[in-house]
């Protein structure tokens, strides 16, 4: 359960991949598209509002061997729009929504090596936001395998 409905803190940051490609957001036909692309040097990076929430994760409820406190985030590149996991389509989409936000908009923030982070779906443990064919997608990660998993690593720069 997410403790409280207001974030513990918020920050603006640009989002890029492990390979330094930028995550950009473009308005097309009244809906937003998400792109993973090499930015031209002079082009300004898109910023995302990261809202941090504390969350209690009782293992007895989830049965996934995870317990204790976690940091959760929501990501909003523009007012009233949030990144959301579409678990059926294995996709990451931008949706306009009102608060309280749906569970699909919450991601467990993971600390990773190389000054990177990962975003795990609250609604689907073990599934992370990742890069597939120059788009964001949902990728299942098996902790028992040595994946290297660069495609789920992201850099946040303020």
């Amino acid at each position: 359960s997410i403790t409280g409905i207001s974030p513990i803190t918020e920050s603006l940051a640009s989002l890029s991949t492990y390979n330094d490609q930028s995550i950009t957001f473009a308005l097309e036909d009244e809906s937003y598209e998400i792109y993973v692309e090499d930015l031209k040097k002079d082009k300004k990076k898109d910023k995302v509002l990261l809202s941090y929430y504390e969350s209690q994760h009782p293992s007895s409820e989830s049965g996934d061997g995870v317990d204790g406190k976690m940091l959760m985030v929501t990501l909003s590149p523009t007012k009233d729009f949030w990144l959301q996991a579409n678990n059926k389509e294995h996709s990451v989409e931008l949706h306009k929504c009102e608060k309280p936000l749906p569970d699909q908009a919450f991601f467990v923030l993971h600390n990773r090596s190389f000054n990177c982070v990962s975003f795990e779906c609250k609604t689907d443990p073990g599934v992370f936001i990742g890069v597939k064919d120059n788009h964001l997608a949902l990728i299942k990660v098996d902790y028992s395998e040595n994946l290297g998993s660069e495609n789920i690593l992201f850099k946040l720069s303020e």
Epitope: I8, T9, E10, S11, L12, A13, L50, Y52, E54, H57, S59, D64, G65, V66, D67, G68, K69, M70, L71, V108, L109, H110, N111, R112, S113, V117, V141, Y143, S144, E145, N146, L147, G148, S149, L156, E158
Partner: antibody, heavy 121, light 111 residues
């Protein structure tokens, strides 16, 4: 119940070796970064070493004071983390704690009871 | 390395009153907009227990009497109202980057 249990401490002569073990229970071990921290009256609490996950090639980090002498390792199939300590010095004396980070690996959340290492002739 | 300076080294506070412990970092412990400062309580013969993480958030099972605040380089732990059971050593620690360092500790006594 989430639990960490250290063992392997004891008395060792300067220049000697010792291997500490920590067995975890009550959680899915391979999802968490593990650390060793030591405590002595002289130096207080001192972070020693960290080992991360299989999916990031078990990245390891060490305090400068133990680099080249201590090795951290883990065996996810045995829910265990180890600290191999070589060329021990008097200043390595202290209580050694095994620590699990929180889910997401941002902070130290669960500490074991500790095992005492005494380096003395 | 980030050096954490805790003050005071010891303090004695009356039951029911407020105890405030400070921790100053030699450089900012903020990253991604989060302050990676944590507080631990240690009683004699026991291992440290997480009280506060990310500057102001309570660890599991920690009473609301314990609160943390601050950002950047200056942080504080507040305990109010103080109870008998709060007599202990308190440590700050940062988890921004390796090496993770701890403050020297504050011994809290109940008057």
């Amino acid at each position: 119940e989430v639990k960490l249990e250290e063992s392997g401490g004891g008395l060792v002569q300067p220049g000697g070796s010792m291997k500490l073990s920590c067995v975890a229970s009550g959680f899915t071990f391979n999802k968490f970064w593990m650390n060793w921290v030591r405590q002595s009256p002289e130096k207080g609490l001192e972070w020693v070493a960290e080992i991360r996950l299989n999916s990031i090639n078990y990245v390891k980090d060490y305090a400068e004071s133990v680099k080249g002498r201590f090795t951290i390792s883990r065996d996810d199939s045995k829910n265990s983390v180890y600290l191999q300590m070589n060329n021990l010095r008097a200043e390595d004396t202290g209580i050694y704690y095994c620590i699990r980070r929180n889910y997401g690996n941002w902070f130290f959340e669960i500490w074991g009871a500790g095992t005492t290492v005494t380096v003395s002739s | 390395d980030i050096v954490l300076t805790q003050s005071p080294a010891s303090l004695a506070v009356s039951l029911g009153q407020r105890a405030t412990i400070s921790c100053r970092a030699s450089e900012s412990v903020d990253r991604y907009g989060i302050s990676f400062m944590n507080w631990f309580q240690q009683k004699p013969g026991q291992s440290p227990k997480l009280l506060i993480y990310a500057a102001s958030n309570q660890g599991s099972g920690v009473p609301a009497r314990f609160s943390g605040s601050g950002s950047g380089t200056d942080f504080s732990l507040n305990i109010h109202p103080l109870e008998e059971d709060d007599a202990a050593m308190y440590f700050c620690q940062h988890s921004k980057e390796v090496p993770y360092t701890f403050g020297g500790g504050t011994k809290l006594e109940i008057k």
